[in-house]
Interface confidence: medium
């Protein structure tokens, strides 16, 4: 490559080998060849000889000028025409790059997906820089003032094992390249508040043989501590609208929820929970489908090995009400 050229002279770039895209650029070549008084000095960009805007400054030096250089990367080299030599003689080469200083990273968010063991932070890097840009995530404990740094691209996974300095942190990103440096706004995170809980699981359903058939859904929330608020939504697969049942209790064991459903119908159930005082809901559990019997006989459903792909309509829930819309949300 260009970087390994053994130069017989010098090549330099003004304003520099890395510069802002759209700038005017001059590339200089100065020969220091033995036994050669060059007739001409030639410039090549990405292997193609330049024909225009070349100026011979003196016996040993020439310049090529580019107006509004807009290529992210280019390989430049220059050669000399030596009298009596059939081939041009290589003088020197340089890789040049153009781009932009980084934007201040924006829209930073950090979450802990339950049981992942990581705090995952993402951000918007802004417009492309076209040049090598490093992102450093700074994490400062507000309880101990300890600060840690992590090198990243456009996201970072930080082991929760390393977050030993308490619950509250300031997190920000610094973007740096050869053309500039920008910091994001500082994000204050409370680890309790950014946990995205794992979904609950509906394990089975059964409809009992009775005068009024009753369907029991067996399910378990993975939220194990404190009080939990849960919602179970269900609907016939032929319906657009979800019905929602709400639960508010202390769950550490398998729950049983009872429903009185139409016979000979296919229903889909989903459940989600939220720890009391916690910001984030679990995602809706995988859809669980149960077929009610035609007549009074017992039917049991178990979850399939493969998740069932069922298009469902989400519900906007108010206590005691249900309305449907046309977006998909199957958890």
């Amino acid at each position: 490559g260009i970087a390994t050229i053994n130069c017989s002279g010098n090549m330099w770039v003004e304003p520099g080998e890395i510069f802002q895209m759209g700038m005017n650029v001059s590339v200089y070549c100065q020969e220091a060849l033995k036994n050669c008084r060059p007739r001409n000095l030639h410039f090549y960009k990405n292997g193609f000889k330049e024909r225009f805007h070349i100026t011979r400054i003196n016996r040993t030096t020439a310049r090529v000028w580019y107006k509004g250089f807009s290529e992210p990367h280019a390989s430049m080299y220059c050669t000399a025409e030596c009298p009596g030599r059939f081939q041009e003689t290589l003088i020197c080469g340089k890789d040049i790059s153009s781009g932009y200083p980084p934007d201040a990273p924006s829209n930073m968010t950090c979450v802990i997906y339950e049981y992942s063991g990581n705090m995952t932070c993402t951000w918007n890097t802004g417009k492309p820089t076209y040049i090598d840009t490093k992102y450093t995530v700074h994490v400062k404990s507000l309880e101990t003032e300890e600060q840690q740094q992590y090198l990243a691209s456009n996201y970072v996974n930080i082991s929760t094992d390393s977050l030993q300095g308490g619950r509250k942190y300031l997190v920000w990103v610094q973007a740096v390249n050869a053309l500039g440096m920008e910091n994001s706004q500082q994000l204050q995170v409370h680890l309790d508040d950014i946990v995205i809980p794992s979904p609950s699981i509906i394990s089975r359903a059964e409809t009992t043989n009775a005068n009024v058939p009753k369907t029991i859904i067996y399910w378990k929330s993975k939220i194990m501590t404190g009080k939990v608020f849960c919602e179970m939504r269900y609907k016939a697969t032929t319906n657009q609208t979800w019905n929602v049942k709400e639960f508010d209790t202390n769950y550490t064991y398998v729950q049983q929820s009872e429903f009185y459903l139409e016979p000979n119908s296919k229903y889909v159930f989903q459940v989600r929970c939220q720890g009391t005082g916690k910001r984030n809901w679990q995602p809706w559990s995988s859809p669980f489908v149960h077929q009610t019997p035609q007549t009074a006989s017992q039917v049991t459903s178990k979850p399939p090995h493969e998740p069932q792909k069922i298009e469902m309509l989400t519900a906007t829930i108010f206590k005691g009400h249900s309305t449907s819309d046309n977006s998909q949300d199957i958890g």
Epitope: E146, Q148, S162, Q164
Partner: antibody, heavy 122, light 106 residues
Amino acid sequence: QIQLVQSGPELKKPGETVKISCKASGYTFTTYGMSWVKQAPGKGLKWMGWINTYSGVPTYADDFKGRFAFSLETSASTAYLQINNLKNEDTATYYCARRDRYGYVAGAFAYWGQGTLVTVSS
Amino acid sequence: QIVLTQSPAIMSASPGEKVTMTCSASSSVSYMYWYQQKPGSSPRLLIYDTSNLASGVPVRFSGSGSGTSYSLTISRMEAEDAATYYCQQWSSYPWTFGGGTKLEIK
């Protein structure tokens, strides 16, 4: 079960150095920070600072900057407290203590070593 | 730094009696933690996050409070509860303990 076992009592002269160990067992050592707490005879508890066992970075409370040093031997699941240039007022029981996690964050000191009595006397 | 002031410094109670001790913070804190220490022993965690009982702690212990005022209550004093009790905060660096309340049995 989780245990923090500290080294035995020490009798030192002023100006000497002491190094106390705290060996952890029953959990992954690098998952929880280790704090050190001082208790002078007949007095209350004073938090000295802590060391992040994942990164090895120590943090010292203001009163314990200078002569005090926290360190780790991760392969041995052991944390150390070293006190240099001992003074009479360093006479105390020193505890290592590990925070627990409630949910996904570090909480209170749920686990304590048995304490190491350091006596400084000429 | 946040100073935690415990009161009373020393108190005594008869078996079966209700006991309340307080911890006052010089600035508002988010959570309070309580420890029990008996002579010759290491401290033991009683209450975390202001009101949650640590593992193995009898239900006669309870914690409450918010802002700058917190309390620890023993609903019915037992002989084994004679000890020194410390409050502690994590909300602001450096972490600090209160001076302790020594609870004696009558």
